[in-house]
């Protein structure tokens, strides 16, 4: 139920990457505004994005308090200019979001190859440890800090002259791989959380190739 000139929000969708988390919904408002509430399963509702005409609300500040909790949000619809108005049941129209557990569901952001260094027939490839918006003791945690050994990286590497992608894996942010002497290689990395059943993989990092600035070559 609700007032005749408001419609309930629908298609409530969580959009989350590396814990930056936004709730999106439809429709674009016509003569109405929205307020969002969020809570954990056992917690109290907290209001965010008061009387907004947007169809999204950044809930990052709330979910980073405990990324392993499961959250529920709801979007209230109010008539524009008359936000005290309620539906026939005595409360404004609202719609619930799906449940969202950040630790299990946030998308893994595109990783970046920080550097690579060749020493003889070995190459050390280092992946940048991306900062998240999750805090502990007033400092922002990295992706590795949050996920620990649950997070692995897959390295794809190939000779510049060929197409077949060899793979290596690490549960740190570094790879040490064997390469053929005198060959140039290209690299791309992918973040993976194997324990998940969905959203297990990130998109691939930009490709970096030997002979470009990021790398360092030392003949031993």
């Amino acid at each position: 139920s609700g007032t005749t000139n408001t419609v309930a929000a629908y298609n409530l969708t969580w959009k989350s990457t590396n814990f930056k988390t936004i709730l999106e919904w439809e429709p674009k408002p016509v003569n109405q505004v929205y307020t969002v509430q969020i809570s954990t399963k056992s917690g109290d509702w907290k209001s965010k994005c008061f009387y907004t005409t947007d169809t999204e609300c950044d809930l990052t500040d709330e979910i980073v308090k405990d990324v392993k909790q499961t959250y529920l949000a709801r979007v209230f619809s109010y008539p524009a200019g008359n936000v005290e108005s309620t539906g026939s049941a005595g409360e404004p129209l609202y719609e619930n979001s799906p449940e969202f557990t950040p630790y299990l569901e946030t998308n893994l952001g595109q990783p970046t190859i920080q550097s690579f260094e060749q020493v003889g027939t070995k190459v050390n490839v280092t992946v940048e440890d991306e900062r998240t918006l999750v805090r502990r003791n007033n400092t922002f945690l990295s992706l590795r800090d949050v996920f620990g050994k649950d997070l692995i990286y897959t390295l794809y590497y190939w000779k510049s002259s060929s197409s077949g992608k060899k793979t290596a894996k690490t549960n740190t942010n570094e790879f040490l791989i064997d390469v053929d002497k005198g060959e140039n290689y290209c690299f791309s990395v992918q973040a993976v959380i194997p324990s998940r059943t969905v959203n297990r993989k990130s998109t691939d990092s930009p490709v970096e190739c030997m002979g470009q600035e990021k790398g360092e070559f030392r003949e031993i």
């Epitope: 060899k166 064997d178 992918q190 993976v192 324990s195």
Partner: antibody, heavy 120, light 107 residues
């Protein structure tokens, strides 16, 4: 329940082509990696190649490089093995298998296999 | 490519026997070794991963161990359903490679 079902095997002449399919259910192939492994009659297991369906990256055993191509149709949740210029020594049961993708666990599920016979 | 040399190629044993199969890697593969069981006409099944971890649902009579580049599969007390062929496989580097297999037959 995780399942992999291969199809498309059969009798083919030397120099001919065949396309095998591997239909997956119970998981989304783009979240994992898919391998093809073969086994000649009375012989051991031989790795053929892999695909990461998420990005299309592949790698092949030297014995099939340039002749076999692995692809994936993520909308159909199916992986494929296109085999060209087939030789008698390619006669085998071909298995597709799921790579769990962790540091520890490698192939955790296998299909039932499909027999490819290359003979004139 | 890394070679996995498996031995013996076959063995005969009785129900209740302790059976040991070994695999030697041609270079360091850390613990990235799995063991599979295959019965005639069937697909292989994962028994052991990461050299020594028992896969879900596999009986505890199966165990794996590592010593350097040597890997061992042990069946502590052979059961009738264990007569099969066993393969080791390294997945430390691409391409992954299998051992030649060990056929465990009834004595």
């Amino acid at each position: 329940e995780v399942q992999l079902v291969e199809s498309g095997g059969g009798l083919v002449q030397p120099g001919g082509s065949l396309r095998l399919s591997c239909a997956a259910s119970g998981f989304t192939i783009s979240d994992y990696w898919i391998h093809w492994v073969r086994q000649a009659p009375g012989k051991g297991l031989e790795w053929v190649g892999y695909i990461d369906p998420y990005n299309g990256y592949t790698y092949y055993a030297d014995s099939v490089k340039g002749r076999f191509t692995i692809s994936a149709g993520t909308s159909k949740n199916t992986a494929y093995l296109q085999m060209n210029s087939l030789r008698a020594e390619d006669t085998a049961v071909y298995y597709c298998a799921r790579d769990y993708g962790s540091l520890q666990v490698f192939i955790d599920y296998w299909g039932q296999g499909t027999l490819v016979t290359v003979s004139s | 490519d890394i070679q996995m040399t498996q031995s013996p190629s076959s063995l005969s044993a009785s129900v209740g026997d302790r059976v040991t199969i070994t695999c030697r890697a041609s270079q360091d593969v850390n613990t990235a070794v799995a063991w599979y069981q295959q019965k005639p006409g069937k697909a292989p099944k994962l028994l052991i991963y990461s050299a020594s971890f028992l896969y879900s649902g596999v009986p505890s009579r199966f165990s794996g161990s590592r010593s350097g580049t040597d890997f061992t599969l042990t069946i502590s007390s052979l059961q009738p359903e264990d007569f099969a062929t066993y393969y080791c496989q390294q997945h430390y580097t691409t391409p992954p490679t299998f051992g030649q297999g060990t056929k465990v037959e009834i004595k």
